[in-house]
Interface confidence: low
Protein backbone atom coordinates (compact mmCIF):
# COMPACT_ATOMS: atom_id res chain seq x y z
CA UNK A 1 0.00 0.00 0.00
CA UNK A 2 1.16 3.55 -0.63
CA UNK A 3 2.71 5.27 2.39
CA UNK A 4 0.64 8.23 3.62
CA UNK A 5 2.47 11.53 3.05
CA UNK A 6 3.49 13.71 5.95
CA UNK A 7 0.96 16.31 4.84
CA UNK A 8 -1.92 13.90 5.44
CA UNK A 9 -0.73 13.15 8.97
CA UNK A 10 -0.22 16.86 9.59
CA UNK A 11 -3.81 17.56 8.47
CA UNK A 12 -5.13 14.81 10.75
CA UNK A 13 -3.21 16.25 13.68
CA UNK A 14 -4.56 19.73 12.91
CA UNK A 15 -8.11 18.37 12.85
CA UNK A 16 -7.64 16.70 16.24
CA UNK A 17 -6.20 19.96 17.62
CA UNK A 18 -9.30 21.80 16.35
CA UNK A 19 -11.56 19.30 18.08
CA UNK A 20 -9.79 19.60 21.42
CA UNK A 21 -9.56 23.39 21.29
CA UNK A 22 -13.13 24.01 20.15
CA UNK A 23 -14.70 21.60 22.60
CA UNK A 24 -17.37 23.37 24.66
CA UNK A 25 -20.00 20.79 25.60
CA UNK A 26 -18.94 17.17 26.23
CA UNK A 27 -17.63 15.80 22.94
CA UNK A 28 -20.17 13.53 21.23
CA UNK A 29 -22.43 13.87 24.28
CA UNK A 30 -19.91 12.00 26.40
CA UNK A 31 -20.02 8.87 24.26
CA UNK A 32 -17.67 6.08 25.28
CA UNK A 33 -15.39 4.17 22.89
CA UNK A 34 -12.99 1.30 23.21
CA UNK A 35 -9.50 2.29 24.24
CA UNK A 36 -6.84 1.04 21.82
CA UNK A 37 -3.22 -0.02 21.89
CA UNK A 38 -1.33 2.89 20.36
CA UNK A 39 1.87 1.00 19.60
CA UNK A 40 0.94 -0.47 16.20
CA UNK A 41 -1.72 -0.17 13.52
CA UNK A 42 -2.98 2.96 15.21
CA UNK A 43 -5.01 4.34 12.28
CA UNK A 44 -7.15 1.29 11.66
CA UNK A 45 -7.56 0.65 15.37
CA UNK A 46 -8.60 4.25 16.00
CA UNK A 47 -11.09 4.09 13.15
CA UNK A 48 -12.52 0.79 14.38
CA UNK A 49 -13.17 2.44 17.73
CA UNK A 50 -14.48 5.81 16.51
CA UNK A 51 -16.66 4.37 13.75
CA UNK A 52 -19.03 3.10 16.43
CA UNK A 53 -19.88 6.72 17.31
CA UNK A 54 -22.74 7.97 15.15
CA UNK A 55 -24.51 11.30 14.97
CA UNK A 56 -21.49 13.26 16.16
CA UNK A 57 -20.60 15.86 13.54
CA UNK A 58 -17.53 16.99 15.49
CA UNK A 59 -15.62 13.82 14.65
CA UNK A 60 -17.02 13.05 11.20
CA UNK A 61 -14.05 14.64 9.45
CA UNK A 62 -11.66 12.69 11.69
CA UNK A 63 -13.45 9.46 10.83
CA UNK A 64 -13.18 10.29 7.13
CA UNK A 65 -9.50 11.20 7.38
CA UNK A 66 -8.67 8.02 9.32
CA UNK A 67 -10.29 6.07 6.50
CA UNK A 68 -7.54 7.38 4.27
CA UNK A 69 -4.86 5.81 6.45
CA UNK A 70 -6.50 2.42 6.85
CA UNK A 71 -6.18 0.17 3.80
CA UNK A 72 -9.02 -2.16 4.68
CA UNK A 73 -12.74 -1.64 5.01
CA UNK A 74 -13.79 -0.88 8.57
CA UNK A 75 -17.36 -1.44 9.72
CA UNK A 76 -19.19 -0.58 12.93
CA UNK A 77 -18.97 -3.40 15.45
CA UNK A 78 -15.63 -4.57 14.11
CA UNK A 79 -13.14 -5.14 16.95
CA UNK A 80 -9.42 -4.99 16.43
CA UNK A 81 -6.93 -7.16 18.27
CA UNK A 82 -5.31 -3.83 19.16
CA UNK A 83 -8.26 -2.90 21.34
CA UNK A 84 -7.41 -2.64 25.05
CA UNK A 85 -9.41 -5.43 26.60
CA UNK A 86 -12.71 -4.31 28.16
CA UNK A 87 -11.62 -0.69 28.59
CA UNK A 88 -13.81 2.18 27.44
CA UNK A 89 -13.01 5.88 27.62
CA UNK A 90 -14.79 9.07 26.61
CA UNK A 91 -14.35 10.23 23.02
CA UNK A 92 -12.73 13.43 24.27
CA UNK A 93 -10.03 11.50 26.12
CA UNK A 94 -9.60 9.15 23.16
CA UNK A 95 -9.00 12.12 20.86
CA UNK A 96 -6.48 13.65 23.27
CA UNK A 97 -4.56 10.37 23.60
CA UNK A 98 -4.58 9.87 19.84
CA UNK A 99 -3.37 13.44 19.28
CA UNK A 100 -0.42 13.02 21.64
CA UNK A 101 0.57 9.78 19.92
CA UNK A 102 0.25 11.15 16.37
CA UNK A 103 2.33 14.20 17.28
CA UNK A 104 5.01 11.81 18.48
CA UNK A 105 4.84 9.85 15.22
CA UNK A 106 5.09 13.07 13.22
CA UNK A 107 8.15 14.25 15.15
CA UNK A 108 9.80 10.88 14.57
CA UNK A 109 8.97 10.96 10.87
CA UNK A 110 6.77 7.86 11.03
CA UNK A 111 4.07 8.51 8.49
CA UNK A 112 2.91 4.97 7.74
Amino acid sequence: SPVPPSTALKELIEELVNITQNQKAPLCNGSMVWSINLTAGVYCAALESLINVSGCSAIEKTQRMLNGFCPHKVSAGQFSSLRVRDTKIEVAQFVKDLLVHLKKLFREGQFN
Epitope: V3, P5, A8, N67
Partner: antibody, heavy 123, light 106 residues
Protein backbone atom coordinates in the same frame (compact mmCIF):
# COMPACT_ATOMS: atom_id res chain seq x y z
CA UNK B 1 -13.75 26.11 -6.57
CA UNK B 2 -12.12 22.74 -7.32
CA UNK B 3 -11.86 22.16 -11.06
CA UNK B 4 -10.13 19.82 -13.51
CA UNK B 5 -9.56 20.75 -17.14
CA UNK B 6 -8.46 18.09 -19.63
CA UNK B 7 -6.76 18.76 -22.94
CA UNK B 8 -4.75 16.92 -25.59
CA UNK B 9 -7.45 14.80 -27.16
CA UNK B 10 -7.91 14.51 -30.89
CA UNK B 11 -7.79 12.26 -33.92
CA UNK B 12 -4.84 9.90 -34.23
CA UNK B 13 -4.01 6.95 -36.47
CA UNK B 14 -3.70 3.40 -35.07
CA UNK B 15 -0.23 2.92 -33.62
CA UNK B 16 0.10 6.64 -32.92
CA UNK B 17 0.56 8.53 -29.67
CA UNK B 18 -1.19 11.25 -27.70
CA UNK B 19 -0.51 12.96 -24.40
CA UNK B 20 -3.46 14.04 -22.33
CA UNK B 21 -3.10 16.78 -19.73
CA UNK B 22 -5.28 17.59 -16.74
CA UNK B 23 -4.77 20.98 -15.11
CA UNK B 24 -6.09 21.30 -11.57
CA UNK B 25 -7.31 24.49 -9.92
CA UNK B 26 -8.65 25.10 -6.44
CA UNK B 27 -6.49 22.41 -4.85
CA UNK B 28 -2.96 21.00 -4.93
CA UNK B 29 -2.83 17.82 -6.97
CA UNK B 30 0.27 16.55 -5.14
CA UNK B 31 -1.80 16.06 -1.98
CA UNK B 32 -4.34 13.88 -3.75
CA UNK B 33 -4.62 10.83 -5.92
CA UNK B 34 -5.63 11.19 -9.53
CA UNK B 35 -7.16 8.81 -12.03
CA UNK B 36 -8.04 8.61 -15.70
CA UNK B 37 -11.36 7.02 -16.58
CA UNK B 38 -12.64 6.55 -20.13
CA UNK B 39 -15.98 5.96 -21.79
CA UNK B 40 -16.27 4.59 -25.30
CA UNK B 41 -19.19 5.90 -27.40
CA UNK B 42 -22.44 4.47 -26.05
CA UNK B 43 -20.59 2.31 -23.52
CA UNK B 44 -19.98 2.29 -19.78
CA UNK B 45 -17.18 3.69 -17.64
CA UNK B 46 -13.76 2.04 -17.67
CA UNK B 47 -10.98 2.91 -15.26
CA UNK B 48 -7.66 3.37 -17.05
CA UNK B 49 -4.95 4.41 -14.61
CA UNK B 50 -4.26 6.02 -11.24
CA UNK B 51 -1.46 7.92 -9.54
CA UNK B 52 -1.47 7.51 -5.77
CA UNK B 53 -1.79 10.46 -3.46
CA UNK B 54 1.32 9.39 -1.60
CA UNK B 55 3.49 10.38 -4.51
CA UNK B 56 4.80 7.59 -6.64
CA UNK B 57 2.70 4.49 -6.94
CA UNK B 58 1.03 4.04 -10.32
CA UNK B 59 -1.72 1.61 -11.32
CA UNK B 60 -3.03 0.51 -14.71
CA UNK B 61 -5.91 -1.45 -16.19
CA UNK B 62 -4.76 -4.60 -17.98
CA UNK B 63 -6.10 -3.21 -21.26
CA UNK B 64 -3.56 -0.35 -21.28
CA UNK B 65 -0.63 -1.78 -19.33
CA UNK B 66 2.65 -1.30 -21.19
CA UNK B 67 1.12 1.25 -23.58
CA UNK B 68 -0.07 4.07 -21.31
CA UNK B 69 1.92 5.96 -18.67
CA UNK B 70 0.45 8.18 -15.97
CA UNK B 71 2.54 10.95 -14.45
CA UNK B 72 2.20 14.16 -12.50
CA UNK B 73 4.03 17.48 -12.51
CA UNK B 74 3.55 19.02 -9.08
CA UNK B 75 5.06 22.34 -10.12
CA UNK B 76 2.41 22.70 -12.82
CA UNK B 77 -0.34 21.10 -10.72
CA UNK B 78 -1.05 18.84 -13.68
CA UNK B 79 -1.75 15.14 -14.24
CA UNK B 80 -0.77 13.48 -17.54
CA UNK B 81 -1.58 10.37 -19.50
CA UNK B 82 0.91 9.40 -22.21
CA UNK B 83 -0.82 7.03 -24.63
CA UNK B 84 1.31 5.04 -27.08
CA UNK B 85 0.52 2.28 -29.58
CA UNK B 86 -3.06 3.47 -29.75
CA UNK B 87 -5.77 1.14 -31.02
CA UNK B 88 -9.27 1.66 -32.35
CA UNK B 89 -10.66 0.32 -29.09
CA UNK B 90 -8.99 3.19 -27.21
CA UNK B 91 -11.47 5.58 -28.83
CA UNK B 92 -13.35 7.22 -25.98
CA UNK B 93 -13.95 10.31 -23.88
CA UNK B 94 -11.17 10.44 -21.28
CA UNK B 95 -12.00 11.91 -17.89
CA UNK B 96 -9.52 13.18 -15.33
CA UNK B 97 -10.64 12.51 -11.77
CA UNK B 98 -9.56 13.68 -8.35
CA UNK B 99 -9.67 10.79 -5.90
CA UNK B 100 -10.96 12.20 -2.65
CA UNK B 101 -8.93 13.28 0.34
CA UNK B 102 -7.01 10.22 1.38
CA UNK B 103 -3.42 9.20 0.83
CA UNK B 104 -4.73 5.71 0.14
CA UNK B 105 -6.51 6.52 -3.09
CA UNK B 106 -8.60 3.38 -3.16
CA UNK B 107 -10.54 4.35 -0.06
CA UNK B 108 -12.12 7.53 -1.34
CA UNK B 109 -14.68 8.21 -3.95
CA UNK B 110 -13.89 9.86 -7.26
CA UNK B 111 -15.51 13.08 -6.17
CA UNK B 112 -14.29 15.61 -8.74
CA UNK B 113 -14.42 14.94 -12.49
CA UNK B 114 -13.26 16.97 -15.44
CA UNK B 115 -15.47 17.58 -18.46
CA UNK B 116 -13.59 15.00 -20.54
CA UNK B 117 -11.49 15.12 -23.69
CA UNK B 118 -12.27 13.01 -26.76
CA UNK B 119 -9.70 10.65 -28.27
CA UNK B 120 -10.49 9.11 -31.66
CA UNK B 121 -8.22 6.40 -33.06
CA UNK B 122 -8.97 5.86 -36.73
CA UNK B 123 -7.19 5.56 -40.05
CA UNK C 1 -10.45 -10.24 -13.31
CA UNK C 2 -13.07 -8.91 -10.91
CA UNK C 3 -16.49 -8.13 -12.35
CA UNK C 4 -19.46 -6.10 -11.14
CA UNK C 5 -22.83 -6.88 -12.69
CA UNK C 6 -25.82 -4.54 -12.80
CA UNK C 7 -29.24 -4.88 -14.43
CA UNK C 8 -29.25 -3.02 -17.78
CA UNK C 9 -32.37 -1.03 -16.94
CA UNK C 10 -34.76 -0.14 -14.13
CA UNK C 11 -38.09 1.65 -14.59
CA UNK C 12 -39.84 3.56 -11.84
CA UNK C 13 -42.85 5.85 -11.50
CA UNK C 14 -42.37 9.34 -10.06
CA UNK C 15 -42.51 9.31 -6.28
CA UNK C 16 -41.81 5.59 -6.09
CA UNK C 17 -38.64 3.79 -4.99
CA UNK C 18 -36.00 2.58 -7.42
CA UNK C 19 -33.47 -0.05 -6.35
CA UNK C 20 -30.36 -0.82 -8.39
CA UNK C 21 -28.25 -3.83 -7.52
CA UNK C 22 -24.55 -4.43 -8.11
CA UNK C 23 -23.24 -7.97 -7.75
CA UNK C 24 -19.68 -9.14 -7.31
CA UNK C 25 -17.83 -11.87 -5.45
CA UNK C 26 -17.66 -10.91 -1.75
CA UNK C 27 -18.44 -7.30 -2.67
CA UNK C 28 -19.51 -6.67 0.92
CA UNK C 29 -15.88 -7.02 1.97
CA UNK C 30 -14.98 -4.01 -0.18
CA UNK C 31 -16.10 -0.40 -0.28
CA UNK C 32 -18.75 0.27 -2.88
CA UNK C 33 -19.32 3.59 -4.65
CA UNK C 34 -22.13 4.79 -6.90
CA UNK C 35 -22.09 7.33 -9.72
CA UNK C 36 -24.85 9.08 -11.60
CA UNK C 37 -24.30 10.12 -15.21
CA UNK C 38 -26.74 12.15 -17.27
CA UNK C 39 -26.45 12.35 -21.08
CA UNK C 40 -23.58 14.53 -22.21
CA UNK C 41 -22.36 15.12 -18.65
CA UNK C 42 -19.51 13.86 -16.48
CA UNK C 43 -20.33 11.29 -13.78
CA UNK C 44 -21.21 12.49 -10.28
CA UNK C 45 -20.43 10.59 -7.09
CA UNK C 46 -23.69 9.96 -5.21
CA UNK C 47 -22.62 7.34 -2.65
CA UNK C 48 -19.21 6.51 -1.20
CA UNK C 49 -18.16 3.99 1.43
CA UNK C 50 -21.28 1.89 0.80
CA UNK C 51 -23.79 4.28 2.30
CA UNK C 52 -22.38 7.79 2.71
CA UNK C 53 -23.62 10.76 0.70
CA UNK C 54 -21.26 13.51 -0.45
CA UNK C 55 -22.42 17.03 0.35
CA UNK C 56 -25.03 18.25 -2.08
CA UNK C 57 -26.49 14.82 -2.81
CA UNK C 58 -30.19 14.61 -1.82
CA UNK C 59 -31.24 12.41 1.08
CA UNK C 60 -33.40 10.31 -1.23
CA UNK C 61 -30.20 8.55 -2.36
CA UNK C 62 -29.05 5.80 -0.04
CA UNK C 63 -26.81 2.76 -0.29
CA UNK C 64 -26.04 -0.54 1.36
CA UNK C 65 -23.52 -3.31 0.82
CA UNK C 66 -23.33 -6.82 2.25
CA UNK C 67 -22.61 -10.31 1.05
CA UNK C 68 -22.20 -10.25 -2.71
CA UNK C 69 -24.51 -7.31 -3.40
CA UNK C 70 -24.43 -3.53 -3.11
CA UNK C 71 -27.69 -1.66 -3.58
CA UNK C 72 -28.43 1.94 -4.50
CA UNK C 73 -31.91 3.06 -3.48
CA UNK C 74 -33.62 6.19 -4.74
CA UNK C 75 -36.65 7.00 -2.59
CA UNK C 76 -39.32 9.29 -3.93
CA UNK C 77 -37.78 9.20 -7.37
CA UNK C 78 -37.98 12.42 -9.36
CA UNK C 79 -37.81 13.03 -13.11
CA UNK C 80 -34.37 14.59 -12.65
CA UNK C 81 -33.07 11.24 -11.35
CA UNK C 82 -33.38 9.70 -14.82
CA UNK C 83 -29.80 8.80 -15.70
CA UNK C 84 -27.24 6.00 -15.98
CA UNK C 85 -25.93 4.66 -12.66
CA UNK C 86 -22.63 2.85 -12.15
CA UNK C 87 -21.33 1.01 -9.12
CA UNK C 88 -17.61 0.81 -8.46
CA UNK C 89 -15.21 -1.04 -6.19
CA UNK C 90 -11.48 -1.51 -5.72
CA UNK C 91 -9.91 -4.95 -6.22
CA UNK C 92 -6.29 -6.05 -6.46
CA UNK C 93 -4.81 -2.67 -7.34
CA UNK C 94 -7.47 -1.81 -9.89
CA UNK C 95 -10.74 0.07 -9.88
CA UNK C 96 -13.69 -1.82 -11.30
CA UNK C 97 -16.88 -0.22 -12.60
CA UNK C 98 -20.17 -2.01 -12.89
CA UNK C 99 -21.85 -2.58 -16.22
CA UNK C 100 -24.23 0.33 -15.66
CA UNK C 101 -27.99 0.66 -15.18
CA UNK C 102 -30.26 3.04 -17.05
CA UNK C 103 -32.97 4.37 -14.73
CA UNK C 104 -36.09 5.52 -16.53
CA UNK C 105 -38.70 7.59 -14.72
CA UNK C 106 -42.03 6.74 -16.33
Amino acid sequence: EVQLLESGGGLVQPGGSLRLSCAASGFTFSSYAGSWVRQAPGKGLEWVSAFSGSGGSTYYADSVKGRFTISRDNSKNTLYLQMNSLRAEDTAVYYCVQDGLGPYFYNYGMDVWGQGTTVTVSS
Amino acid sequence: SYELTQPPSVSVSPGQTASITCSGDKLGDKYSFWFQQKPGQSPVLVIYHDSKRPSGIPERFSGSNSGDTATLTISGTQAMDEADYYCQAWDSSTYVFGTGTKVTVL
